[in-house]
Interface confidence: medium
């Protein structure tokens, strides 16, 4: 005979656990239904009645199957200089990220408290390490035989073109100039770019089975450009 399907609430067999999307209620000592994402437990279960769930109110959410008494608050509204990459819904927190070309320089668990513009490497310097969501660009001087003639947070040092006859030797900030009509080898025209970091700020997710901390959102401090660092400019 097939095993009888138990309907919540039910007392679990000794040593067994509750099924998926159920939780064990210590007070009722029964397996009871969890509430679906976008809902919360309005009334906890008893020995004779199952969990009563209710929809999350505006500006609150639950991301997982849960039995929390109230939904979690969505994070603060994104500031004017931030990008809202995920809206606050009943099932997910708002996510704010630093706008393109910026990175998070000061953060807490709630998210980014300070977005700062990515450092730009000035001519004669190239990007040694590209910026990420949480780290600035690192610039390095162009080594002999390479140059960068741009002020950029993405351009690396490029090799000088090799001439049959050099009219003007290249330096760290300028390519070589050839006298012949066609150099022996030249780079493809245009600067070499490193990809911009893509903002995909990870969020703190609800722990299970005891949700105690809210997923975070990110925040921006509007600010001016960074002062120049060695080999960089804040322009």
């Amino acid at each position: 005979l097939p095993a009888q399907v138990a309907f919540t609430p039910y007392a679990p067999e000794p040593g067994s656990t509750c099924r998926l999307r159920e939780y064990y209620d210590q007070t009722a000592q029964m397996c009871c239904s969890k509430c679906s994402p976008g809902q919360h437990a309005k009334v906890f279960c008893t020995k004779t009645s199952d969990t009563v769930c209710d929809s999350c109110e505006d500006s609150t959410y639950t991301q997982l199957w849960n039995w929390v008494p109230e939904c979690l608050s969505c994070g603060s509204r994104c500031s004017s200089d931030q990008v809202e990459t995920q809206a606050c819904t009943r099932e997910q927190n708002r996510i704010c990220t630093c706008r393109p070309g910026w990175y998070c320089a000061l953060s807490k668990q709630e998210g980014c408290r300070l977005c700062a513009p990515l450092r730009k490497c000035r001519p004669g310097f190239g990007v040694a390490r590209p910026g990420t969501e949480t780290s600035d660009v690192v610039c390095k001087p162009c080594a002999p035989g390479t140059f960068s003639n741009t002020t950029s947070s993405t351009d690396i040092c490029r090799p000088h073109q090799i001439c049959n006859v050099v009219a003007i030797p290249g330096n760290a900030s300028m390519d070589a100039v050839c006298t012949s009509t066609s150099p022996t080898r030249s780079m493809a025209p245009g600067a070499v770019h490193l990809p911009q970091p893509v903002s995909t700020r990870s969020q703190h997710t609800q722990p299970t089975p005891e949700p105690s901390t809210a997923p975070s959102t990110s925040f921006l401090l509007p600010m001016g450009p960074s002062p120049p660092a060695e080999g960089s400019t804040g322009d």
């Epitope: 979690l72 608050s73 969505c74 994070g75 603060s76 509204r77 500031s79 320089a105 000061l106 668990q109 709630e110 998210g111 980014c112 408290r113 300070l114 700062a116 600035d136 105690s212 901390t213 809210a214 997923p215 975070s216 925040f219 921006l220 401090l221 509007p222 600010m223 001016g224 450009p225 960074s226 002062p227 804040g234």
Partner: antibody, heavy 120, light 111 residues
Framework: QVQLQQSGAELARPGTSVKLSCKAS????????IDWVKQRTGQGLEWIGE????????YYNEKFKGKATLTADKSSSTAYMQLSSLTSEDSAVYFC?????????????WGQGTSVTVSS | DIVLTQSPASLAVSLGQRATISCRAS??????????MHWYQQIPGQPPKLLIY???NLESGIPARFSGSGARTDFTLTIDPVGAVDVATYYC?????????FGGGTKLEIE
Amino acid sequence: QVQLQQSGAELARPGTSVKLSCKASGYTFTDDYIDWVKQRTGQGLEWIGEIYPGSGNTYYNEKFKGKATLTADKSSSTAYMQLSSLTSEDSAVYFCARSQVYGKIAMDHWGQGTSVTVSS
Amino acid sequence: DIVLTQSPASLAVSLGQRATISCRASESVDNSGNSFMHWYQQIPGQPPKLLIYRASNLESGIPARFSGSGARTDFTLTIDPVGAVDVATYYCQQSKEDPYTFGGGTKLEIE
């Protein structure tokens, strides 16, 4: 306008606990931090910790871990600080203050303070 | 922890003159071109009041005779000209990292 209203003065016996309250109004309570600061008579200011009411996340000065417990009630826009195992060293004025998550990142509005006296 | 050292501990200035208070941090409180140093005024019997945030920004409603300057580890609060209502204790505070810390305070008096 932003206001933080703190509970009245407390007289407590050594070894007991007190729970101070700080009711916020004039802004979205869950959007910013509530900080707590201690000031002993004639002394300077000491940061105890802060709570983000939106999530309940707390940050403590190591010196006050085990002494202070910060909580918040979103429904009443009230932050609480419980001080336990009181000694004479805990006699002080305790301030709550708001600190914006972004912007100033400073304590721009303060409660009037709650005086706690520990005496047998 | 970042230690903030204020000097002088007390200061007597004539009305209309300039008062300068210094705050030195044990390590830099700068991050990406911002200095996370703030200045507060506390009149006896009252809570502190924010005067200057992030080193040099004047808080709304604070008179322009208050100004802040500095970067990294050395910061200054200037009151020019000093008025009778400025008698108070002034504190610097950093919020670059937990635990947030305050300076020991500078008591301003009128001579």
